[in-house]
């Protein structure tokens, strides 16, 4: 299972549910579905209030039981460490894969934290982070922001990933904007 890590804004916008949580148990494998689930303790929800409705407490996260079919394996044994988890809802259950955005909260830049808590949502409706994987690449729409981090360094560690969001400048136009300047 291979996938290019997405820009955090893309992860936020494409996910049904974005939460902050601690992994508090060892994985359990369901003997019918062959999915494994991790027990989590959710501390914050950033996206998914409407999708979840009244069932606003997520206690488990589900993933395939094998890496080759994109199963996520949680390596940290620190049960007090908080993680940002962006996943999909299937039958009311939170599902993630190795391609999902799952990162220690403390590893996120202040700008990314701001993005997840407040700003990324502003760009979801109209704007698209467009990955530039090889030169030359050009914008296909005014609402696209060219994401070039992969050309220069690891995509998650790039400047655009860590500090910028693709946000509307005016109708029909999106541009990279600094999340730093928006931090109160």
């Amino acid at each position: 299972c291979t996938c290019v890590p997405p820009h955090p804004q893309t992860a936020f916008c494409n996910s049904d549910l974005v939460i902050r949580a601690k992994f508090v148990g060892t994985p359990e494998v369901n003997q019918t579905t062959l999915y494994q689930r991790y027990e989590i303790k959710m501390t914050k929800m950033y996206k998914g209030f409407q999708a979840l409705g009244d069932a606003a407490d997520i206690r488990f996260v589900y993933t395939p039981a094998m890496e080759s079919v994109c199963g996520y394996f949680h390596r940290s044994h620190n049960r007090s460490e908080e993680f940002l988890i962006a996943g999909k809802l299937q039958d009311g259950l939170l599902h993630i894969t190795t391609c999902s955005f799952v990162a220690p909260w403390n590893s996120l830049s202040l700008a990314q934290r701001r993005g997840f808590t407040k700003t990324y949502t502003v760009g979801c409706e109209e704007c698209t982070v467009f990955p530039c994987l090889s030169i030359p690449c050009k914008l296909q729409s005014g609402t696209h922001c060219l994401w070039t981090d992969q050309l220069l360094q690891g995509s998650e560690k790039g400047f655009q990933s860590r500090h910028l969001a693709c946000l509307p400048r005016e109708p029909g136009l999106c541009t990279w904007q600094s999340l730093r300047s928006q931090i109160a």
Epitope: V29, T33, E67
Partner: antibody, heavy 113, light 111 residues
């Protein structure tokens, strides 16, 4: 009581195909994931493949990926293993297992020219 | 291509206790509470003796017990009997390979 009965083993030439079946009884078949495990003569156990209760998720060992296909027919309470492009190293007793708690008696597959 | 390491053989006299170890990694034994132990007599199918590290299926003698510490699981057989002579295999879930077995341990009951 839980019963698993494998069939379909036999002698086949390298490059040939074989389809194993496992008839299950004594439990709600669709509620359990099923697996195939094999044991080469005088060797240890090797997991081959697994399938979820609905058949929607399938997993394979690297050694058989692309050559073997696991499937199930819940209406017939039967598990299958379609084996293509067989090699000498696939020679083994093949066991079907209910999520590893109950095992059949096995069926011998011999790949030889 | 064996992921879990077991001693090739162990032996003990009737009435004694023996322990078989099963060493893996944090992606299998250490990462899950899913270690099983199987007993296999020659020409027979494996029989589940312990599941989920330390649980015994109904019908299995309480002389068999399992435990785990870190990346190593153990099967202990107390009050060894002649019919315990068999091959024993450990198994664990593994997120890379779904499930893995140990290479097997031949238990010989002396005398």
């Amino acid at each position: 009581q839980v019963q698993l009965v494998e069939s379909g083993g036999g002698l086949v030439q390298p490059g040939g195909s074989l389809r194993l079946s496992c008839a299950a009884s004594g439990f709600t078949f669709s509620s359990y994931a099923m697996s195939w495990v094999r044991q080469a003569p005088g060797k240890g156990l090797e997991w081959v493949s697994a399938i979820s209760g609905s058949g929607g998720s399938t997993y394979y060992a690297d050694s058989v990926k692309g050559r073997f296909t696991i499937s199930r027919d819940n209406s017939k309470n039967t598990l299958y293993l379609q084996m293509n492009s067989l090699r000498a190293e696939d020679t083994a007793v093949y066991y079907c297992a209910r999520f590893f708690d109950y095992w059949g008696q096995g069926t011998l597959v011999t790949v030889s020219s | 291509d064996i992921a879990l390491t077991q001693p090739a053989s162990v032996s003990g006299s009737p009435g004694q206790s023996i322990t078989i170890s099963c060493t893996g990694t944090s992606s299998d034994v250490g990462g899950y509470n899913y270690v099983s132990w199987y007993q296999q007599h020659p020409g027979k199918a494996p029989k589940l003796m312990i599941y989920d590290v330390s649980n015994r299926p109904s019908g299995v003698s309480n002389r068999f017990s399992g435990s785990k510490s870190g990346n190593t699981a153990s099967l202990t057989i107390s009050g060894l009997q002649a019919e315990d002579e068999a091959d024993y295999y450990c198994q664990s879930y593994d997120y890379q390979q779904f499930t893995v077995f140990g290479g097997g341990t031949k238990l010989t009951v002396l005398g």
